[in-house]
Amino acid sequence: QLPPGKPEIFKCRSPNKETFTCWWRPGTDGGLPTNYSLTYHREGETLMHECPDYITGGPNSCHFGKQYTSMWRTYIMMVNATNQMGSSFSDELYVDVTYIVQPDPPLELAVEVKQPEDRKPYLWIKWSPPTLIDLKTGWFTLLYEIRLKPEKAAEWEIHFAGQQTEFKILSLHPGQKYLVQVRCKPDHGYWSAWSPATFIQIPSDFTMND
C-alpha cells in the first residue's frame, strides 16, 4: 500500500470559448481508494478554487460552465490525488481558453451534382457552422476542410475551403458513389471531428474535368 502516483492533466477543450473541460489521467492508486480534486487559480490571482463540476465531462474530468469561463484569463490548474497513505500532485497546467477551442462538427452537410448546360458539371457541397459557435461576435473565424472519396477507395481527397461554407469540386469519377465529410477549426485551436458522411451517386454521364 502506497501513496497515489502522480496524475497528469492531458487535455483541455472548449467547444466555443464559453465553456471548457479538462481531463486527467490518474497515476497508480497505490492499492487504495483514491480521491481526485482539481484546483485552479487565474493568472494574477492567488485565490484558489476547486473544480465546479466533476460530472458533466465524465470520469476524471472538470467542466467549467459559462459562469466560470473567462476568455481573457489564463487558468493555472493542478490535480491532487489523495489516499490513506498520502497525496501527489500533477504538474501545473496553464490554460488559455482561446487556444483550446475544438468546435463541434459543421452541420447540415448537403451535396448535390450540378450539371449546367453551358459549363462543366460539378459537385456542389454546402454546410452550416456548428450551432454553439456564434460567428456574429467576430470572436471566431472558422476554417473548413472537406474530404471525399469513392465508397470503396482507401484514400481520401482533401480540399481546404477557407472560411466559405460552400465548395465546388469538378474532378470526379462518373458512376461512382462518393462519401463526403466536412470539419472545421477556429483560427487558434483544434480541428473538429469530421461530420457524419453524406453519400452522393455521381451519374455515369458526369464528364470529368480536363
Partner: antibody, heavy 118, light 107 residues
C-alpha cells in the same frame, strides 16, 4: 428564483457563541464558492470568510481567525458560520454571499443581525 | 495585506452631474476590482467587475476604469435613485478587501 436566506442571529453576551446558517435555493449550491461578509452598524462592508465549492479551501479575515469557523453542507444546500468567543466589535449584520465564476459577489442574502452585548 | 482606499468618503452633487469616485490599491491588482452599490437599508448590489465590465441589468450611466492600483467609478448623469454608498473591492487574493465606501447624496 435564486435566493440566500440567513438565520441564527440574535443577542449574545461577550464570550458567547452563535451559529449562523444560510439556506440556498434556485441554483446548484454545490458548484459555488460561498462567503460571509459583515457590516457593523453605520460602517462599511467587511469580508470575513470564504469556502470553496467542496469545502477544501477556506480563508478567514484576521479579525475572526481562530474564533469563527465556516463550513457547508452541500446535501442540505446550506452554509454555516460558527462564531465562538464573541466580542462587542463582532456586532454587525452578517450576509452570506455567493461568489460567481469570475470571483465577484453576485448574489447576497438579506442579512441577519448579531448583537454582542452584556 | 493589500489595502483599498476610496475617495472621497462622501460627496453631494446635483441631478444630471457627472460623478467620479476613486479607489486606490496599496499594491497592483491588475483589473481584479469590483464596484458595489448599497442603497440605505438594502443589500449590496454588484455594479461592475474586472474594473470595467458592467453587470447585466446595470444602467449604462455607470462605468468603471483603471488597472493596477488606480481605479474609478463614474456616474455620467447622476439620478435620484443613485443615492447610495459605493464600495470597491479587490478579489485577486484573500482577504477580499473592500474599500471604506463613498456616500453619494443629491444636493
Amino acid at each position: 428564483e435564486v435566493q440566500l436566506v440567513e438565520s441564527g442571529g440574535g443577542l449574545v453576551q461577550p464570550g458567547g457563541s452563535l451559529r449562523l446558517s444560510c439556506a440556498a435555493s434556485g441554483f446548484t449550491f454545490s458548484s459555488y464558492e460561498m462567503n460571509w461578509v459583515r457590516q457593523a452598524p453605520g460602517k462599511g462592508l467587511e469580508w470575513i470568510s470564504y469556502i470553496s465549492s467542496r469545502g477544501g479551501t477556506i480563508y478567514y479575515a484576521d479579525s475572526i481567525k481562530g474564533r469563527f469557523t465556516i463550513y457547508r453542507d452541500n446535501a442540505r444546500n446550506s452554509l454555516y458560520l460558527q462564531m465562538n468567543s464573541l466580542r462587542a466589535e463582532d456586532t454587525a449584520i452578517y450576509y452570506c454571499a455567493r461568489l460567481s465564476g469570475v470571483d465577484i459577489f453576485d448574489i447576497w442574502g438579506q442579512g441577519t443581525m448579531v448583537t454582542v452585548s452584556s | 495585506d493589500i489595502q483599498m482606499t476610496q475617495s472621497p468618503s462622501s460627496l453631494s452633487a446635483s441631478v444630471g452631474d457627472r460623478v467620479t469616485i476613486t479607489c486606490r490599491a496599496s499594491q497592483g491588482i491588475s483589473n481584479y476590482l469590483a464596484w458595489y452599490q448599497q442603497k440605505p437599508g438594502k443589500v449590496p448590489k454588484l455594479l461592475i467587475y474586472f474594473a470595467s465590465t458592467l453587470q447585466s441589468g446595470v444602467p449604462s450611466r455607470f462605468s468603471g476604469g483603471g488597472s493596477g492600483t488606480d481605479f474609478t467609478l463614474t456616474i455620467s448623469s447622476l439620478q435620484p435613485e443613485d443615492v447610495a454608498t459605493y464600495y470597491c473591492q479587490r478579489y485577486n487574493s484573500a482577504p477580499l478587501t473592500f474599500g471604506g465606501g463613498t456616500k453619494v447624496e443629491i444636493k
